[in-house]
């Protein structure tokens, strides 16, 4: 397994609709043909997989139909969007990139993006 540098922003604030987007960039010494991107969430020393996608370079990322993630790729940059977030989902979201093909296998893990989610205040009842 060969190590690879992965960069991602330190902090992102989710929108009022619970959507957060960030770029995950991996620094490979060459052009892979098959890449796997996994988003992990770390909270209270627990790490859970949020979503994952394998894609062929030059093609779109395809997450599972029921995934909360969507994404696009351009070169070695993956633009990730996580939807349906609530305040309880605040945490460190780590981007893991694997170069699956051709060999040898490369693995890179980012330092994580702290995503802050603030639940919107409910609208006060109107007297009108």
């Amino acid at each position: 397994c060969k190590a690879m540098h992965v960069a991602q922003p330190a902090v992102v604030l989710a929108s009022s609709r619970g959507i957060a987007s960030f770029v995950c960039e991996y620094a490979s010494p060459g052009k892979a043909t098959e890449v796997r991107v996994t988003v992990l969430r770390q909270a209270d020393s627990q790490v859970t997989e949020v979503c994952a996608a394998t894609y062929m370079m030059g093609n779109e990322l395809t997450f599972l139909d029921d995934s909360i993630c969507t994404g696009t790729s351009s070169g070695n940059q993956v633009n990730l969007t996580i939807q349906g977030l609530r305040a309880m989902d605040t945490g460190l979201y780590i981007c893991k990139v694997e170069l699956m093909y051709p060999p040898p296998y490369y693995l890179g893990i980012g330092n994580g993006t702290q995503i802050y989610v603030i639940d919107p205040e409910p609208c006060p009842d109107s007297d009108f």
Epitope: H5, P29, G30, K31, G75, N76, P102, P103, Y106
Partner: antibody
Framework: DVQLQESGPGLVTPSQSLSLTCSVT?????????WNWIRQFPGNKLEWMGY???????NYNPFLKNRISITRDTSENQFFLKLNSVTTEDTATYYC????????????WGQGTSVTVSS | DIVLTQSPSSLSASLGGKVTITCKTS??????MAWYQHKPGKGPRLLIY???ILQPGIPSRFSGSGSGTDYSFSINNLEPEDIATYYC????????FGGGTMLEIK
């Protein structure tokens, strides 16, 4: 550590074929990477010629496509360059090198072998 | 073919000083840029890949930056062993090299 070493005749006659060998130690050429030939002309210009991948597939510089062949001997962990119909313009120092992926940075190189095309 | 225009072709600098080499590509190469040091009688040595990532074992005096079609490479605190020819290489589409920059110490 990975090491690459080029060998072959230093003098080739015009219109003949140029044949070079790259011997690799410290890594199996079938385990991964692409195994390249690059040449440096007098005056220092570097030109990528082509490669043979770990799986035996090739990719060649379009400018050389009908003259070049890169093959390998997996039992000896060597790969070879054959360049047909050479002219004096093919006089250069020839290097073998390794890179990751379809295209990539060359992380290990041989020290090069000088080839002169002359009658 | 992607063409790389490297400049200057030669330069002279003082020990302890800083030098910068630029490489302009004929189209966007998505940061797939590498830099090499080449000394006579040896094969080129990979210094930097993916625009700015130092190859293991390369001193941090060497650095790279850029995006799109404009890339640069710098050496800080020049040392005598830095005398060499330096090349850029793109690996977005095929592998092509710049024309080289010969560095000498004043």
């Amino acid at each position: 550590d990975v090491q690459l070493q080029e060998s072959g005749p230093g003098l080739v006659t015009p219109s003949q074929s140029l044949s070079l060998t790259c011997s690799v130690t410290g890594y199996s050429i079938t385990s991964g990477y692409s195994w390249n030939w690059i040449r440096q002309f007098p005056g220092n210009k570097l030109e990528w010629m082509g490669y043979i991948r770990f799986d035996g597939n090739n990719n060649y510089n379009p400018f050389l496509k009908n003259r070049i062949s890169i093959t390998r001997d997996t039992s000896e962990n060597q790969f070879f360059l054959k360049l047909n119909s050479v002219t004096t313009e093919d006089t250069a120092t020839y290097y073998c090198a390794r890179n990751y992926g379809t295209w990539g940075a060359m992380d290990f190189w041989g020290q090069g072998t000088s080839v002169t095309v002359s009658s | 073919d992607i063409v790389l225009t490297q400049s200057p072709s030669s330069l002279s600098a003082s020990l302890g000083g800083k030098v910068t080499i630029t490489c302009k590509t004929s189209q966007d190469i998505n940061k797939y840029m590498a830099w090499y040091q080449h000394k006579p009688g040896k094969g080129p040595r990979l210094l930097i890949y993916y625009t700015s990532i130092l190859q293991p074992g390369i001193p941090s005096r060497f650095s790279g930056s850029g995006s799109g079609t404009d890339y640069s490479f710098s050496i800080n605190n020049l040392e005598p062993e830095d005398i060499a020819t330096y090349y850029c290489q793109q690996y977005d589409n095929l592998n092509t090299f710049g024309g080289g920059t010969m560095l000498e110490i004043k």
